[in-house]
C-alpha cells in the first residue's frame, strides 16, 4: 500500500491527521459511509486538544462524530477504547432518551452548540467531520 504524506485538497491538517468538515447534514450512517468512501472515518476525539481544534472549526452547530452505541456499548468507529479514552459529554448525557417520539432511543454522539457531547437519534441530518491519519499505509489490497 501507499502512505499518505499530505492532506487531500479541502482537508485541514492538524497533529498528523487530516480533517474534513461538512457544510450540510446527513444521517449518521450516511455520514459514516461518506467518510469511508474518502478512506477516512468519522472523527475520533482522543484529547482535549483535539476537541478544541474540532470545536473551533465546526462552530456552534450540531455535528456527528465517530461514536455510537447502536450495538450495545459505546464504541469509537476506529476501535479506540471508549472506557479509557477522552470524553466530553454534557451533564446527564448520554441518556438514551426515548421521549423524542421518533422510535427507539439515542445511539449516536454529536458535538452540541457548546462543543460538549450529546447522544441523539441517528437519523437526524447533522453536519459531520471526517478524519484520516497521515503516514498511515492505505488499505489498498495487495496485487494478486
Amino acid at each position: 500500500g501507499s502512505e499518505r504524506t499530505c492532506c487531500p485538497v479541502n482537508w485541514v491538517e492538524h497533529e498528523r491527521s487530516c480533517y474534513w468538515f461538512s457544510r450540510s447534514g446527513k444521517a449518521w450512517a450516511d455520514a459514516d459511509n461518506y467518510c469511508r468512501l474518502e478512506d477516512a472515518h468519522l472523527v475520533v476525539v482522543t484529547s482535549w486538544e483535539e476537541q478544541k481544534f474540532v470545536q473551533h472549526h465546526i462552530g456552534p452547530v450540531n455535528t456527528w462524530m465517530g461514536l455510537h452505541d447502536q450495538n450495545g456499548p459505546w464504541k469509537w468507529v476506529d476501535g479506540t477504547d471508549y472506557e479509557t479514552g477522552f470524553k466530553n459529554w454534557r451533564p446527564e448525557q448520554p441518556d438514551d432518551w426515548y421521549g423524542h417520539g421518533l422510535g427507539g432511543g439515542e445511539d449516536c454522539a454529536h458535538f452540541t452548540d457548546d462543543g460538549r457531547w450529546n447522544d441523539d437519534v441517528c437519523q437526524r441530518p447533522y453536519r459531520w467531520v471526517c478524519e484520516t491519519e497521515l503516514d498511515k499505509a492505505s488499505q489498498e489490497p495487495p496485487l494478486l
Partner: antibody
Framework: EVQLLESGGGLVQPGGSLRLSCAAS????????MSWVRQAPGKGLEWVSV????????YFADSVKGRFTISRDNSKNTLYLQMDSLRAEDTAVYYC?????????????WGQGTMVTVSS | DIQMTQSPSSLSASVGDRVTITCRSS??????LNWYQQKPGKAPKLLIF???SLHSGVPSRFSGSGSGTDFTLTISSLQPEDFATYYC??????????FGQGTKVEIN
C-alpha cells in the same frame, strides 16, 4: 483529457460470469471513489456499486449483493466489476463513473458504457 | 431507499422555450440533488450538483433550485442540442444513490 473507457461486455448465459474493466486517464485515479451505474434497455439509471480510492471500502446495491465484486488496481488506473451468477435482469449498459464531487455525491465523468446481455 | 419521482415523464417543446422539470424525493434530502443530461446512445453528463451549482462547462441557460423534497431544473431558452433525457439523482443516502425515472424533452 479526463477519460473513462469500459470494456468486457458481451453475451453470457444465465448463471454465467463476466468481468468488466474501466481504464481511467487524465486524473489522479487513486484519489477518487469510483462507481458502476447500469441502464437496462429503454430504462433509467441504477447505481450498482462503489469503491473507495484505496479499494478498502466497497458497497453494493441490494440487487447485486453477493453476486458482484468491485475492485481496482491503482497501479494500472483500472476499475473492475466481476459479475457472477448473472440473471436476465442484469442485462444493461454498464457505465463506470467517477465520484468527482464528493460533497454532492455527484458523478462528474462517465465512460461510454459497455453492453452486457444475459440470455440463453 | 429514497425514491425519486420526476415530472413530467416527457414533454414537447420548441427552440427558445423555457422548460421546467421537477424532481421530488420521498424524504428530505437537504440539497443533495444532482441533474444529468443523456442523449440516445451516449453516457449521462453532469449538469447541476448540490441542487443549484452549475458544473464546469455547462451553459448558463441551465439552472437548478430547491431543497428538502422538491427540486427544479430549468432551461431558460431551449436550444437544439438540449433535446435529451434528463435525470435527477439524490446524493443524501451515501452510497445507496437513486435516480429519477427520467424526463424526455422532445421537439414540438
Amino acid at each position: 483529457e479526463v477519460q473513462l473507457l469500459e470494456s468486457g461486455g458481451g453475451l453470457v448465459q444465465p448463471g454465467g460470469s463476466l468481468r468488466l474493466s474501466c481504464a481511467a486517464s487524465g486524473f489522479t485515479f487513486r484519489s477518487y471513489a469510483m462507481s458502476w451505474v447500469r441502464q437496462a434497455p429503454g430504462k433509467g439509471l441504477e447505481w450498482v456499486s462503489v469503491i473507495s480510492g484505496s479499494g478498502g471500502n466497497t458497497y453494493f446495491a441490494d440487487s447485486v449483493k453477493g453476486r458482484f465484486t468491485i475492485s481496482r488496481d491503482n497501479s494500472k488506473n483500472t476499475l473492475y466489476l466481476q459479475m457472477d451468477s448473472l440473471r436476465a435482469e442484469d442485462t444493461a449498459v454498464y457505465y463506470c463513473a467517477k465520484r468527482g464531487i464528493p460533497e454532492a455525491d455527484a458523478f462528474d465523468i462517465w465512460g461510454q458504457g459497455t453492453m452486457v446481455t444475459v440470455s440463453s | 431507499d429514497i425514491q425519486m419521482t420526476q415530472s413530467p415523464s416527457s414533454l414537447s417543446a420548441s427552440v427558445g422555450d423555457r422548460v421546467t422539470i421537477t424532481c421530488r424525493s420521498s424524504q428530505s434530502i437537504n440539497s443533495y440533488l444532482n441533474w444529468y443530461q443523456q442523449k440516445p446512445g451516449k453516457a449521462p453528463k453532469l449538469l447541476i450538483f448540490a441542487a443549484s451549482s452549475l458544473h464546469s462547462g455547462v451553459p448558463s441557460r441551465f439552472s437548478g433550485s430547491g431543497s428538502g423534497t422538491d427540486f427544479t431544473l430549468t432551461i431558460s431558452s431551449l436550444q437544439p442540442e438540449d433535446f435529451a433525457t434528463y435525470y435527477c439523482q439524490q446524493g443524501y443516502n451515501t452510497p445507496t444513490w437513486t435516480f429519477g425515472q427520467g424526463t424526455k424533452v422532445e421537439i414540438n
